[in-house]
């Protein structure tokens, strides 16, 4: 409608690391003579319309979302209706709607993408002694407490991708963070290096682990 309050949010998702604070930006253009007494602001979960935080009747009504949200009170009068979400959790991921009502009303939805980096993979070998060329071994690459689910890639010492005989499992813990275990079954050559790369698709962060088998003994590269 003509003259309806225009509510603006970022088009791209806001990416926030687990445990950090995130700002969900939202703005509107106040008309001349605007006062906070005219403003009714509602932040809500888009899908359910559950209340997250509100500013009505000229005052901040506080957080309705685990007491982890806050507005920027000094900036509201300039049209900054952004929401601060503290100590981000995996469960916070999703769409939030900023609903602004002054003389008329408008709304816009902003997406929150939660992320957590994966730990440096630990490598284990089974069996891990008396290895000879021709033996079949299983190499397990484990990386912990990341989000969202990882992409896992294996390669040999020459950088050739290894795609056969790979089994990857990802399990979420009680916080929703994933532990990834990827198992490569290979037939040993005279010697060889096997690397696993655990990629966080949101952070574009790669965590590398490798094991080098040189007949006997077997060596693990030092931790980076």
């Amino acid at each position: 409608p003509t003259g309806a309050v225009e509510v603006q949010v970022p088009e791209d998702p806001v990416v926030a690391l687990v445990g950090t604070d995130a700002t969900l930006r939202c703005s509107f253009s106040p008309e001349p003579g605007f006062s906070l007494a005219q403003l009714n602001l509602i932040w809500q979960l888009t899908d359910t319309k559950q209340l997250v935080h509100s500013f009505t009747e000229g005052r901040d009504q506080g957080s309705a979302y685990a007491n982890r949200t806050a507005l920027f009170p000094d900036l509201l009068a300039q049209g900054n209706a952004s929401l601060r979400l503290q100590r981000v959790r995996v469960a916070d991921e999703g769409s939030f709607t900023c609903f602004v009502s002054i003389r008329d009303f408008g709304s816009a939805a902003v997406s929150l993408q939660v992320a957590a980096p994966y730990s440096k993979p630990s490598m284990t070998l089974e069996p891990n002694k008396d290895l000879r060329p021709g033996d079949t071994v299983t190499i397990t690459c484990s990386s912990y407490r990341g989000y969202p689910e990882a992409e896992v890639f294996w390669q040999d010492g020459q950088g050739v991708p290894l795609t056969g005989n790979v089994t990857t499992s990802q399990m979420a813990n009680e916080q929703g963070l994933f532990d990834v275990h990827s198992v490569l079954r290979v037939v040993l050559g005279a010697n060889g290096t096997y690397s696993c790369l655990v990629r966080n698709p949101v952070l574009q962060q790669d965590a590398h682990g490798s094991v080098t088998i040189t007949g006997q003994p077997m060596t693990f590269p030092p931790e980076a």
């Epitope: 409608p1 309806a4 309050v5 509510v7 009714n40 509602i42 809500q44 888009t46 899908d47 359910t48 319309k49 559950q50 209340l51 009505t56 769409s95 709607t97 609903f99 009502s101 002054i102 003389r103 008329d104 009303f105 408008g106 709304s107 816009a108 939805a109």
Partner: antibody, heavy 124, light 109 residues
């Protein structure tokens, strides 16, 4: 259970105005958006505008801008829709429908409660 | 102006499954459009069936379900009953206004 009860049928002359009421019984108008939707004979549903009674703020479809005024009286849980400069093609059934601004139950049922409709006939 | 497209008419048989869709001229329908589905029968006021894309309104039978399919809002009726013969309208929210589709007339033969 909330019910929306609308005022009775109206017959109006071209150029005049009509004011239709919508009273919420068994509940409150807050925190909701009361929408006004019309249906001309043999046509589909058309959103005209809506009001948030708690805030007293209204929006209108561009087509009706300047010709429709939507108001609400929180004390009587009643919303009103006034349409002016009536023409014959405004002959229609006018409905109010409740939509939640904030879903207090945590579930967004959308436009789940509708009034029974008010027939407005514009004829000279 | 925002245009919304629904199938003008669909025919199904009792006990069958039918899916009605609602396409927006602005692009893919998302959860922030809060797709609503409204049923209208002759001589009766419209009845809200589905809100918020997939939430059944109180009293809506379980055979009605809402979803997003291929960028469109969809209403699926599983195990169609003769009393489901009606016109079904979708409505989408765009920041500050609702827009209704033209309606789908569902015939049961």
């Amino acid at each position: 259970q909330v019910q929306l009860v609308q005022s009775g049928a109206e017959v109006k002359k071209p150029g005049s105005s009509v004011k239709v009421s919508c009273k919420a019984s068994g509940g409150t108008l807050r925190p909701v958006l009361i929408n006004w939707v019309r249906q001309a004979p043999g046509q589909g549903l058309e959103w005209m505008g809506g009001i948030i009674p708690l805030f007293g703020t209204a929006n209108y479809a561009q087509k009706f801008q300047g010709r429709v005024t939507i108001t609400a009286d929180e004390s009587t849980s009643t919303a009103y829709m006034e349409l002016s400069s009536l023409r014959s093609d405004d002959t229609a059934v006018y409905y109010c429908a409740r939509d939640q601004v904030v879903a207090t139950s945590g579930v967004n049922f959308g436009m789940d409660v509708w009034g029974q409709g008010t027939t407005v006939t514009v004829s000279s | 102006d925002i245009q919304m497209t629904q199938e003008p008419s669909l025919t199904t048989s009792p006990g069958g499954t039918v899916t009605l869709t609602c396409r927006s001229s602005t692009g893919a329908v998302t959860t922030s459009n809060y797709a609503n589905w409204v049923q209208e029968k002759p001589g009766q006021a419209p009845r809200g069936l589905i809100g918020g894309t997939n939430k059944r309104a109180p009293g809506t039978p379980a055979r009605f379900s809402g979803s997003l399919i291929g960028g469109k809002a969809a209403l699926t009726i599983t195990g169609v009953q003769p009393e489901d013969e009606a016109i079904y309208f979708c409505a989408l929210w765009y920041s500050n206004l609702w827009v209704f589709g033209g309606g789908t007339k569902l015939e049961i033969k």
